[in-house]
């Protein structure tokens, strides 16, 4: 039996003969911009861009159903034009066109905002682009804008605006000595400004021998006033008021003195936590310091909250190291020796590509990154000792590691 006439749109046919008898063959080639869709018994078996397929007449039926479908470029995205939204009323197949509009605050540069779906399934190269601009930068609390042009609304990516912190404020992160007041922010690729900030200048805490004796109006921040109340005898002795004021340069305008009535010495520190040793070469008078040390090799003296013991320190707790205690004018030791404990110090093998269980805690900077795949230099965690469990003591615990970032928790992977 002869096969029906072979008709394929957007294709050229090359048949072995004009007859369509059993065994006759035709080669089907799609026109440029179209792809072959090959079906057998109505089931798609292949989709190919080229170059051709041969069909055979078998018992009155062509052995494959062939169609030439236009190439689909799919909806364009930011890879074609950054900061644009696209409209494709004609669809996204070969020959159709999409237009784009720039998303605020980006602006069109060029005049042809059309893309054409090309024969290779790619969009034509854009003849215009969306140039990102920043609006006027937002006000920075406690800072003055120094660049006049920055009050306008159009700023190219990469342009800067200069600010200066108001008196009594400084740029965070600048050193205590050189409290920087001027800073710049930059218009970034996504049309937003880099963040800038001004934080209040702070003074150093008063000497520890006055701990617990003073009250301050606003902590140790600029303009705060700290006061120790002395009995009236001080004034009659000509010592003046025991008040200090934090100045805008981060220094106190004076210093506290020990009130007349504050006399005596601290009690001998006893009932120390295990392995802790105090050495008090200058005795126990007000202002005397005792050096803290631990009897165990490579243990360190640290302060723990009242309810935490050395045995149950959670890995995320980063206790403060302490080197000395001071006898305050209130005749109390500061910090209180009962809060000082000895913990195992960090082994000196951080950042060496082995996850040392003993160092896998905040106190030891999570072994310098050796316990997380994202931070270990070799990108492979090797536990030490070898018996250490990668789900236990050698698990990735560092909260800063990529493994614990919000993105990862949502199932995204990082490139």
């Amino acid at each position: 039996t002869d096969c029906p006439e072979l008709a394929v749109e957007n294709a050229s046919l090359n048949c072995s003969s004009s007859d369509r008898y059993h065994g006759a063959q035709c080669t089907v080639s799609c026109r440029t911009g179209y792809v072959l869709q090959i079906r057998r018994d109505d089931e798609l078996i292949k989709s190919q861009t080229g170059p051709s397929v041969t069909v055979t007449c078998t018992e009155g039926k062509w052995n494959k159903q062939v169609a030439c479908e236009p190439v689909d470029c799919s909806i364009p995205d930011h890879h074609q034009v950054y900061a644009a939204s696209f409209s494709c009323p004609e669809g996204t197949t070969f020959g159709s066109q999409c237009s784009f509009q720039c998303r605020h605050p980006a602006q069109l540069k060029g005049n042809n905002s059309l893309l054409t779906c090309m024969e290779d399934g790619l969009w034509s190269f854009p003849e215009a682009l969306c140039e990102l601009m920043c609006l006027a930068p937002p006000p920075v609390p406690n800072a003055d804008l120094q660049t006049a042009r920055c009050r306008e609304n159009k700023h190219k990516v990469g342009s800067f605006c200069k600010y200066k912190c108001k008196p009594g404020y400084h740029v965070p992160g600048s050193s205590r000595k050189s409290k920087k007041r001027a800073f710049k922010t930059q218009c970034t690729q996504d049309g937003s400004w880099q963040e800038g900030a001004c934080v209040p200048v702070t003074c150093d805490p008063p000497p520890p021998k006055f701990h617990g004796l003073y009250q301050c109006t606003n902590g140790f921040q600029f303009n705060s006033e700290c006061r120790i109340k002395c009995e009236d005898s001080d004034a009659s002795q000509g010592l003046g008021s025991n008040v200090i004021h934090c100045r805008k340069d981060g220094t106190w305008n004076g210093s506290f003195h020990v009130c007349q009535e504050m006399q005596g010495q601290c009690s001998v520190p006893n009932e120390l936590n295990s392995n802790l040793k105090l050495q008090c070469p200058d005795g126990y008078a007000i202002g005397s310091e005792c050096a803290t040390s631990c009897l165990d090799h490579n243990s360190e003296s640290i302060i723990l909250p009242m309810n935490v013991t050395v045995r149950d320190i959670p890995h995320w707790l980063n206790p403060t190291r302490v080197e000395r205690v001071v006898c305050t004018a209130g005749l109390k030791w500061y910090p209180h020796p009962a809060l000082i404990h000895c913990v195992k110090g960090c082994e000196p093998f951080m950042g060496d590509n082995y996850c040392d269980a003993i160092n896998n805690r905040a106190f030891c900077n999570y072994d310098g990154g050796d316990c997380c795949t994202s931070t270990v230099k070799t990108k492979k965690v090797t536990p030490f000792p070898m018996s250490c469990d990668l789900q236990g003591d050698c698990a990735c615990r560092d909260p800063q590691a990529q493994e614990h970032s919000r993105k990862d928790l949502r199932g995204y992977s990082h490139g």
Epitope: N298, G345, C346, P348, M350, G351, D352, N353, F384
Partner: antibody, heavy 123, light 107 residues
Amino acid sequence: EVQLVESGGGVVQPGRSLRLSCAASGFTFSSYAMHWVRQAPGKGLEWVAVISYDGSIKYYADAVKGRFTISRDNSKNTLYLQMNSLRAEDTAVYYCARHERIPPWGFHTFDIWGQGTLVTVSS
Amino acid sequence: DIQMTQSPSSLSASVGDRVTITCRASQGISIYLNWYQQKPGKAPKLLIYGASSLQSGVPSRFSGSGSGTDFTLTISSLQPEDFATYYCQQSDGTPWTFGGGTKVEIK
């Protein structure tokens, strides 16, 4: 060639100070923890001190704690041992040694040693 | 601190002999033990790490065994260049401690 070369030894009176240096070459010094190990004449090896790759962590043997200070200058590829309040029992050959962790399990070893420098504490 | 005890402190042997040196730790150290060889006037040299692994370049006549507290260094057939002092060292944790040494002398 991987090499450690100590210097700074000599004769010193009890109570005085001395600073030893160890110059490293042929490897990335700033990636390794380093040690000082000493050997009294005719005696065995005694570990003295260790310093982490970046100098942030230091530990000492009880016999030298509070008197000796280990330090390093990674820009100069040099390890130091500052020895104060020296005693007769500190007389020894002082070796610097590289701390290597051998794969795959990370065993701790002293894999490269210097030739040593002799410190004699005597009045 | 972990104490390391070596025995014997010295031994005399001939070329070709099988030599065994033992080392005992005051507490369990798993397999975290190294052996070093030191010749007169020279720096120590790492022979064996992890109780039994041979450091690269060290002849196969040297072998180590043991775990926990008891360890052994064996030289299967003593060669002239093997006359030296041998030290064990625990690498379980700071402070690193060495054994007192075993001097291998020519008989």
